[in-house]
């Protein structure tokens, strides 16, 4: 309907216009993670606060069991930040056969699960080598992008090491999505 | 009105539809910060360019005195990048009682001020230890997420050390928000 | 039309309302870069996948020859992540005249080209010194912000060193834009 008149009143028009305020949206914030078993070679998923403080879900966007459930097909902007913290990682010191060793690393993956697909789809990955000498370290990884999702898709955030996630503040580690 | 007809012409409809082009939006860019006094234990706020170059405010989103003023309640996407730069931080050298010393760090906080609340709310925080040996260093911290804001809320960007902010280019350090 | 009735049916209204689903949008993903000549003092541009896997363009947003072509004036959210990877950069070791040498660095720039302007405009820059000792390293730079663009503007992503870009996975290095 861009740049043209509304159709005359005697003609009924099916319009995909919709109020912005009723679009599915969620912003989830970090909670302390309980250690859980996870599949070998699969990064563990974080679970989230969805109601308290800054966290919310609205307009049929629901959070359950580590997943954001997509209630409506469309293009979504999806984002997450995970702040990691750890002790000294003196990865420069130990070398095998004269080669630099494989560095320690931290990784965040935003993953889509579609029930009809056997494999999850990695939508976004942020991965960083960590070679901090001489002190405790902390740093965030931020991700965000737009994806075409289908009703019933599920989103989760996986991390390489759940024990390094900074769960102390809701503004440091978070996960969100909104229909564009 | 999603997926249904417009109401017949004899029936007047109150619709929360609105043109996307009239939504409050702002993109602010860095200017040189003048050293100013700030409260103890509170990170100083950055001030911003709001008109020149890439910067703009529109549709009643106003910038004044380091704050973006929210003109209308709703869900906003808020983002900022701050590029920091500094000199060698040889934090690996000094250890007390065999323990690694507390590292230098850089921090960005996007803060919401609501006049009716006594305390500001930290919406987003990016914080990173800095342990750079042997040369000057520079690096960005990026933040972005969606929040439900109320008319009259004020947003600002606080940093741990205003003297480390790279103010040289409008594309390196910036702050923005838009109503979804 | 916010918060007020639709005009009576006998009055035709020019409305800038439009279906969200028909807005120009694109999400591009990394492909292996072919080494190409680029102008001195100008960072090389990345080329992208625009159809396969997670990548798409829609609603007249077209990708051609390293550029996203803006089909309609308006405010766009633009984002990119580039994951870099490299070998040890022992930039703390070599000093000239007692001064630390200029550090290695990685840089991403999102650039706007307007045919009527002689010079490209740098919209966003993420730049980071790299001083990794003792192992291979990898890390992402993420950028995202809102800009007012004109029909016919072209967007590209430039990097400081194309040989350091991790092109192995579509979730690690990407570029997107959507009309708000």
């Amino acid at each position: 309907l861009k740049g043209q008149e509304f159709a005359p009143s005697h003609q009924q028009v099916y319009a995909p216009l919709r109020a912005d305020g009723d679009k599915p949206r969620a912003h989830l914030t970090v909670v302390r993670q309980t250690p859980t078993q996870h599949f070998k070679n699969q990064f563990p998923a974080l679970h989230w606060e969805h109601e308290l403080g800054l966290a919310f879900t609205k307009n049929r966007m629901n959070y359950t069991n580590k997943f954001l459930l997509i209630p409506e097909s469309g293009d979504y902007f999806i984002y997450s930040q995970v702040t990691f913290r750890g002790m000294t990682s003196e990865c420069s010191e130990i070398r095998q056969a004269g080669r630099p060793n494989k560095p320690d690393s931290i990784t965040v993956v935003i993953t889509k699960v579609t029930d009809s697909y056997p494999e999850p789809t990695q939508l976004l990955m942020g991965t960083k080598s960590v070679c901090e000498v001489g002190s405790n370290w902390f740093q965030p990884i931020y991700l965000g992008a737009m994806f075409s999702l289908q009703e019933g898709d599920k989103l989760m955030v996986n991390v390489s090491d759940i024990s390094l996630v900074d769960y102390t503040k809701e503004d440091k580690t978070f996960f969100g999505a909104f229909l564009l | 009105l999603k997926g249904q007809e417009f109401a017949p012409s004899h029936q007047q409809v109150y619709a929360p539809l609105r043109a996307d082009g009239d939504k409050p939006r702002a993109h602010l860019t860095v200017v040189r910060q003048t050293p100013t006094q700030h409260f103890k234990n509170q990170f100083p706020a950055l001030h911003w360019e709001h008109e020149l170059g890439l910067a703009f405010t529109k549709n009643r989103m106003n910038y004044t005195n380091k704050f973006l003023l929210i003109p209308e309640s709703g869900d906003y996407f808020i983002y900022s990048q701050v590029t920091f730069r500094g000199m060698t931080s040889e934090c690996s050298e000094i250890r007390q009682a065999g323990r690694p010393n507390k590292p230098d760090s850089i921090t960005v906080v996007i803060t919401k001020v609501t006049d009716s609340y006594p305390e500001p709310t930290q919406l987003l925080m990016g914080t990173k230890s800095v342990c750079e040996v042997g040369s000057n260093w520079f690096q960005p911290i990026y933040l972005g997420a969606m929040f439900s804001l109320q008319e009259g809320d004020k947003l600002m960007v606080n940093v741990s050390d205003i003297s480390l902010v790279d103010y040289t280019k409008e594309d390196k350090t910036f702050f923005g928000a838009f109503l979804l | 039309l916010k918060g007020q009735e639709f005009a009576p049916s006998h009055q035709q209204v020019y409305a800038p309302l439009r279906a969200d689903g028909d807005k120009p949008r694109a999400h591009l993903t990394v492909v292996r870069q072919t080494p190409t000549q680029h102008f001195k003092n100008q960072f090389p541009a990345l080329h992208w996948e625009h159809e396969l896997g997670l990548a798409f363009t829609k609603n007249r947003m077209n990708y051609t020859n390293k550029f996203l072509l803006i089909p309609e004036s308006g405010d766009y959210f633009i984002y990119s992540q580039v994951t870099f990877r490299g070998m040890t950069s022992e930039c703390s070791e070599i000093r000239q005249a007692g001064r630390p040498n200029k550090p290695d660095s990685i840089t991403v720039v999102i650039t706007k080209v307007t045919d009527s302007y002689p010079e490209p405009t740098q919209l966003l820059m993420g730049t980071k010194s790299v001083c990794e000792v003792g192992s291979n390293w990898f890390q992402p730079i993420y950028l995202g912000a809102m800009f007012s663009l004109q029909e016919g503007d072209k967007l590209m992503v430039n990097v400081s060193d194309i040989s350091l870009v991790d092109y192995t996975k579509e979730d690690k290095t990407f570029f997107g834009a959507f009309l708000l």
């Epitope: - | 050293p35 100013t36 000199m87 050390d161 003297s163 902010v165 040289t168 | -």
Partner: antibody, heavy 117, light 107 residues
Framework: ELQLQESGPGLVKPSETLSLTCAVS????????WAWIRQPPGKGLEWIGD???????SYNPSLKSRVTVSVDTSKNQFSLKLSSVTAADTAVYYC???????????WGQGTLVTVSS | DIQMTQSPATLSLSPGERATLSCRAS??????LAWYQQKPGQAPRLLIY???RRATGIPARFSGSGSGTDFTLTISSLQSEDFAVYYC?????????FGQGTKVEIK
């Protein structure tokens, strides 16, 4: 090599205008602010003011009415003009790079300007 | 303007000794304080910024501490090349101001 080099007359008459130029080499001129600082003989340091490549300036209020700092990016240099000088303006004048912000990590060698008739 | 007061005016010490220089601001400057070293006939040299961050290439024997109004520069073991005048500078407010200097001389 990173270098800042002041130049200008070493003697200025009272009530006239002191003019100095600082040439910057080996550094990205656009990435920093550039400052003037002076030091009267046997005394401490006084910040005069600074400028960036876009011509944005800030000045010490005590000197603001008499000071102009300007920039010529094509030559990678910036200049100081101090009007209506008196004997109290006799000093070694330094140009310096403002880095990290509001501190000065690279300095010229300084040039002594004497105000005398 | 914020006034910066350094003490003592002169410090007489022997090589190998520890030097402690003080700088006081007339009002709080948070940690926005720098220290410089100046030798006769030379330009000042940045030693410390941010009250405690060593500038590039500065030896570890130089350290800074303090916040608010009271700051200290410590030279853990004086070397012959350390005998010079030391200035503090605040950048917590404009105009930027310097102290009057402390001379560290050989006893």
């Amino acid at each position: 090599e990173l270098q800042l080099q002041e130049s200008g007359p070493g003697l200025v008459k009272p009530s006239e205008t002191l003019s100095l130029t600082c040439a910057v080499s080996g550094i990205s001129f656009n990435d920093f602010h550039w400052a003037w600082i002076r030091q009267p003989p046997g005394k401490g340091l006084e910040w005069i003011g600074d400028i960036n490549h876009r011509g944005h300036t800030s000045y010490n209020p005590s000197l603001k009415s008499r000071v102009t700092v300007s920039v010529d990016t094509s030559k990678n240099q910036f200049s100081l003009k101090l009007s209506s000088v008196t004997a109290a303006d006799t000093a070694v004048y330094y140009c310096a790079r403002d880095y990290p912000n509001f501190t000065f990590d690279l300095w010229g060698q300084g040039t002594l300007v004497t105000v005398s008739s | 303007d914020i006034q910066m007061t350094q003490s003592p005016a002169t410090l007489s010490l022997s090589p190998g000794e520890r030097a402690t220089l003080s700088c006081r601001a007339s009002q709080s400057v948070s940690t926005y304080l720098a220290w410089y070293q100046q030798k006769p006939g030379q330009a000042p040299r940045l030693l410390i910024y941010g009250a405690s961050r060593r500038a590039t290439g500065i030896p570890a024997r130089f350290s800074g501490s303090g916040s608010g109004t009271d700051f200290t520069l410590t030279i853990s073991s004086l070397q012959s090349e350390d005998f010079a005048v030391y200035y503090c500078q605040q950048y917590g407010d404009t105009p930027l101001t310097f102290g009057q200097g402390t001379k560290v001389e050989i006893k």
